[in-house]
Interface confidence: medium
Amino acid sequence: LLVSQGVLLKCQKGSCSNATQYEDTGDLKVNNGTRRNISNKDLCASRSADQTVLCQSEWLKYQGKCYWFSNEMKSWSDSYVYCLERKSHLLIIHDQLEMAFIQKNLRQLNYVWIGLNFTSLKMTWTWVDGSPIDSKIFFIKGPAKENSCAAIKESKIFSETCSSVFKWICQY
């Protein structure tokens, strides 16, 4: 099931600033049918010292954030859960410089899931932290419709069926 109702908290400058930060994003139905609640409290735990962030083993650091590149392949929702379970989130790309960093570190030529999907609720492309994509900077190649998730390849963002299996990138 595509996660489109819940909104992940933006953890900026390493602090979770208000009381709403620990609200649950709601139930997430995983492919095996089980449900689990994800608290935003977890999402911010590893961002408490953004300016002096130390990335875990196997994570790359760039501009105060940590990035992890998968080797296996999963659907978008399974990739989403995987990142959350590791107190991170699917990749959110803020600008072309960050995109360039990502591409530089992508060794494979195939598609890689990022934290962007078309939400049927908002009828727009939305990052997993709830922010809309900046359409002036990024163009999503392909249709904007229900059950579409975004994957990157060669600095391009493509609309793909969320059930497709690709590698993915986690970020915190």
Partner: antibody, heavy 117, light 105 residues
């Protein structure tokens, strides 16, 4: 380059399959293969696209769903199956490749194949 | 769905002159617009993408401009070979304008 084939004169209600063959490149990840049609003396009308990557996801114009099926049949061919054809389907059908990331535009086109119903 | 409205339907100009074709989107498409040229019996040819970027091999006489909802294709120093129908296309596959026939006298 791209070349279409399979255009023919058919009776209303008939089915027809068009084929698009690529030369000089093979289908791979990173772009979409599409069909666009043009009725005589009319404008361009998008029919469908198929993703050239492994997932092969398909996308159709709302009016084309159900009657038209786009498929990737090999690393160099894409087909368009058309059923329950009517006179309104009479058009030149173009195969086009969309590999731009600066909009959903078509960079490479085939010469077209005429379907007359 | 985004609807592209193209004007005029037909325009006539002399060799060496200038032609302006307008395309309006029903909602903002930022700069995600392409222009095509089509001659009788031929497939369309990509002229401009991302509103103002010339496709390879297209002469600089063709100029695209605009953003948001209003876009313009300007053809200057008209040549006989520019006689054709021109189409705009918005940021989705199905969003074609109705076309503008350019007649060069």
């Amino acid at each position: 380059s791209l070349e279409e084939s399979g255009g023919d004169l058919v009776k209303p209600g008939a089915s027809l399959t068009l084929t698009c063959t690529a030369s000089g490149f093979s289908f791979s990840s990173g772009y979409y293969m599409c069909w666009v049609r043009q009725a005589p003396g009319k404008g361009l009308e998008w029919i469908a696209c198929i993703y050239a990557g492994s997932s092969g996801s398909t996308h159709y114009a709302s009016w084309a769903k159900g009657r038209f099926t786009i498929s990737k049949t090999s690393s160099t061919t894409v087909t368009l199956q058309m059923t329950s054809l009517t006179a309104a389907d009479t058009a030149t059908h173009f195969c086009a490749r969309d590999d731009g990331n600066s909009g959903d535009y078509f960079k490479i086109w085939g010469p077209g194949t005429l379907v007359t119903v | 769905d985004i609807v592209m409205t193209q004007t005029p339907a037909s325009v006539e100009a002399a060799v060496g002159g200038t032609v302006t074709i307008k395309c309006q989107a029903s909602q903002s498409i930022y700069s995600w617009l392409a222009w095509y040229q089509q001659k009788p019996g031929q497939p369309p040819k990509l002229l401009i993408y991302k509103a103002s970027t010339l496709a390879s091999g297209v002469p600089s006489r063709f100029k695209g401009s605009g953003s948001g909802t209003d876009f313009t294709l300007t053809i200057s120093d008209l040549e006989c070979d520019d006689a054709a129908t021109y189409y705009c296309q918005g940021n989705s596959w199905g969003a074609f304008g109705g076309g503008t026939e350019v007649v060069v006298k």
